[in-house]
């Protein structure tokens, strides 16, 4: 999906108002220094592409993030503010959900969510730079 035509301001507002709180809740008990940020993004559409991938594409080490509240909220936000996102992505991520079988490795999921927090912060920063 090409995130170029999204309403970035409204996505930022949703993130700051609600998604960020759920991500932080998920990470509670860990320190910001526990994980190194290895994933980065260069502009707003690129950040959303990376966020989409880390949130919804299951990996062998962490297969269950799509069921989390922050993921459901991310999906709703992208559906609302990225025209055409629903048609191209929702069915695909639902199919992945059904296919998922492997057990969660909690620490690896925490590491992945830590990367997500970094990507969202980068998304906000690139938004501020443009204004």
């Amino acid at each position: 999906y090409d995130f170029t035509n999204c309403d970035f301001q409204k996505i930022e507002a949703d993130y700051l108002r609600t998604i960020s709180k759920d991500l932080i809740t998920y990470m509670s008990g860990t320190k910001s220094t526990d994980f190194n940020n290895t994933v980065s993004c260069s502009n707003r559409p690129h950040c959303l592409t990376e966020i989409q991938s880390l949130t919804f594409n299951p990996t062998p080490r962490c297969a269950s993030l799509a069921k989390e509240m922050f993921a459901r909220k991310t999906k709703a936000t992208l559906a609302l503010w990225c025209p055409g996102y629903s048609e191209t992505q929702i069915n695909a991520t639902q199919a992945m959900k059904k296919a998922r079988k492997s057990k969660v490795t909690t620490n690896k999921c925490l590491e992945q969510v830590s990367q997500l927090l970094g990507l969202w912060r980068r998304f906000i920063r690139t938004l501020l730079k443009k204004q």
């Epitope: 949703d14 108002r17 709703a76 929702i90």
Partner: antibody
Framework: QVQLVQSGAEVKKPGSSVKVSCKAS????????ISWVRQAPGQGLEWLGV????????IYAEKFQGRVTITADTSTSTAYMELSSLRSEDTAVYYC?????????????WGQGTLVTVSS | QSALTQPPSASGSPGQSVTISCTGT?????????VSWYQQHPGKAPKLMIY???KRPSGVPDRFSGSKSGNTASLTVSGLQAEDEADYYC???????????FGGGTKLTVL
């Protein structure tokens, strides 16, 4: 049973406000969009606005901006639509309608409608 | 003033086909594949008949079909039956600010 049940008919004076409720049952209320659509006597459908409780987002039709307020109480699975500064042209049947999950612009389930009459 | 334009009436005999048009702009129908159609019988709430231009919800007969060309969407009812007599409304997504527009409605009469 999957349904939307709306509050009863209202008669209001011009200049006053009306608040209509819409109670959902049989589905996960927060994940869907709840839109409000009205229909004046003998007229077509007119969209007022939508709320997506999951992300606490509301979008209003430009025509009703500042006059309509849509809220939701997830604890009771109830959506509300308040319309202020009522005039006779607001006399209509007001429907709540469920927007499909992540496809909030298709209304696959409707309430029975609430007749709001504005008359002095 | 409706954002989407529909003919006020359409008619056909039982067994025939009838097509109802819905004309918008590049900002709504032409810009997105997010057209839906609703059937409304007198005194009843509307019912979703078509979504995403041409998809049918479960329970809707395959006599109902939808299509789109440019800025115009169409609903075709084939093999008309008496119970198809109703008002039909098109609707289109119209962007993140405007969200949804309805057409003015078409009264379908089965002769």
């Amino acid at each position: 049973q999957v349904q939307l049940v709306q509050s009863g008919a209202e008669v209001k004076k011009p200049g006053s406000s009306v608040k209509v409720s819409c109670k959902a049952s049989g589905f996960t209320f927060g994940s869907y969009g709840i839109s409000w659509v009205r229909q004046a006597p003998g007229q077509g459908l007119e969209w007022l606005g939508v709320i997506v409780p999951l992300v606490d987002v509301t979008i209003y039709a430009e025509k009703f901006q500042g006059r309509v307020t849509i809220t939701a109480d997830t604890s009771t699975s109830t959506a509300y639509m308040e319309l202020s500064s009522l005039r006779s042209e607001d006399t209509a049947v007001y429907y709540c309608a469920r927007g499909q999950e992540y496809f909030y612009w298709y209304f696959d389930l409707w309430g029975q409608g609430t007749l709001v009459t504005v008359s002095s | 003033q409706s954002a989407l334009t529909q003919p006020p009436s359409a008619s056909g005999s039982p067994g025939q086909s009838v097509t109802i048009s819905c004309t918008g702009t590049i900002s709504d129908i032409g810009g997105y594949n997010r057209v839906s159609w609703y059937q409304q019988h007198p005194g009843k709430a509307p019912k979703l008949m078509i979504y995403e231009v041409s998809k049918r919800p479960s329970g809707v007969p395959d006599r109902f079909s939808g299509s789109k060309s440019g800025n115009t969407a169409s609903l075709t009812v084939s093999g008309l039956q008496a119970e198809d007599e109703a008002d039909y409304y098109c609707s289109s997504y119209a962007g993140t600010d405007t969200f949804v527009f309805f057409g003015g409605g078409t009264k379908l009469t089965v002769l």
